[in-house]
């Protein structure tokens, strides 16, 4: 059996299948590695596009698991980044394995907006709450922000009334309809006994990526009384 000290320069295998997944702007790098007689450790480095004198920054150093959260090392979520991973076994290191280009805003997933529905006088009020995401470790909403290109530009709101569906588009930049917490849609209540079911999804600026669609929430109006 070969000892680690005897391994040749290229005998530490390179990690494989370096991929990045992001949910709610929280990107995590994953990779695969073959089983070794000695436990390997990994170093993960990130390079952001569009940063002056962009260089590889350490994100995780000498870790034994096969994933690394790089959310603290992402600049503008609209910009591209690359990741590379190397393995170390004893005193020897592998070559780097590099990821594909990844932009958190373009390639990641964002969860659905939350919905609230209620009756106010002669109308149904629908509140669409912006999804919460994590940017540089801080929780914030993906509402309109002129300082970044990664924000929800429009909500598609789907309203089913007694079987027929109507789609509304809400532009988030319009302050009368939206603020930094939510957007609001008002629909007249018909005089008939009616059920209103609502779901919504956001559309991100620039790439037109859609968030996950919310679960449908419903309200039934019985002669001016409400059943949620």
């Amino acid at each position: 059996e070969m000892g680690t000290a005897d391994l040749g320069p290229s005998s530490v295998p390179t990690p494989t299948n370096v991929t990045i997944e992001s949910y709610n702007m929280n990107p995590i790098v994953y990779w695969e590695y073959q089983i070794m007689p000695q436990v390997p450790v990994f170093t993960v480095e990130v390079k952001n596009y569009g940063v002056k004198n962009s260089e590889w920054i350490d994100a995780c150093i000498n870790i034994s698991h096969h994933y690394c959260n790089i959310s603290d090392h992402v600049g503008d979520p609209s910009n591209s980044l690359w990741v590379r991973v190397k393995a170390r076994v004893g005193q020897k290191e592998s070559a780097y394995a590099k990821s594909e280009e990844f932009a958190v805003c373009r390639d990641g997933k964002i969860g659905p907006p939350k919905l609230d529905i209620r009756k106010e006088e002669k109308q149904i009020m629908i509140d669409i709450f912006h999804p919460s995401v994590f940017v540089n470790g801080d929780e914030q909403e993906v509402d309109y922000d002129p300082e970044t290109t990664c924000y929800i530009r429009v909500y598609n709101v789907y309203v089913r009334m007694n079987g027929s569906e109507i789609q509304y588009k809400i532009l988030t930049q319009k302050e009368d309809d939206c603020d930094e917490i939510q957007c609001q849609l008002a629909i007249p209540v018909s005089s008939l006994n009616s059920q209103y079911c609502v779901s919504a999804e956001g559309v991100l600026h620039v790439w037109g990526v859609t968030t996950e669609k919310s679960k449908e929430v419903c309200i039934t109006i019985f002669n001016s009384s409400i059943k949620g």
Epitope: K122, Q123, I124, I166, Y168, K169, I170, L171, Q173, K174, E175, D176, D177, C178, Q184, L185, A186, I187, P188, S190, S191
Partner: nanobody
Framework: QVQLVESGGGLVQAGGSLRLSCTAS????????MGWFRQAPGKEREFVAT????????SYANSVKGRFTISRDNAKNTVYLQMNSLKTEDTAVYNC?????????????????WGQGTLVTVSS
């Protein structure tokens, strides 16, 4: 109380474009959600599009989605309907309607005030 006057209708060939305008009297135009409806000869009145008070929220009938665009200019007390790629089945009298408050209706009964209408004829 608000009075609505439509204009911009006429005869156009299939595939052509028209822009309808609806001007409201009074100084409280921004209080009203606005809608466009149409009625073809011998048919029921049909919802076309609606727009919120600020202009930030819109909705369209499936039959016109991607071809028609509703917009408004609150400074001019006017709501517009830009109609592109017109089809013969778009031939109808087009009415604009106003509803006091934020609620955006898709039924005629949702609206409080109506214009007299403008005729759009699309020929083949």
């Amino acid at each position: 109380q608000v009075q609505l006057v439509e204009s911009g209708g006429g005869l156009v060939q299939a595939g052509g474009s028209l822009r309808l305008s609806c001007t409201a009297s009074g100084r409280t135009f921004s209080r009203y959600a606005m809608g466009w409806f149409r009625q073809a000869p011998g048919k029921e009145r049909e919802f076309v599009a609606t727009i919120s008070r600020s202009g930030g929220t819109t909705s369209y009938a499936n039959s016109v989605k991607g071809r028609f665009t509703i917009s408004r200019d609150n400074a001019k007390n006017t709501v517009y309907l830009q109609m592109n790629s017109l089809k013969t089945e778009d031939t109808a009298v087009y009415n604009c309607a106003a509803r006091d408050g934020p609620a955006m209706g898709v039924f005629g009964s949702d609206y409080d005030y109506w214009g007299q209408g403008t005729l759009v004829t699309v020929s083949s």
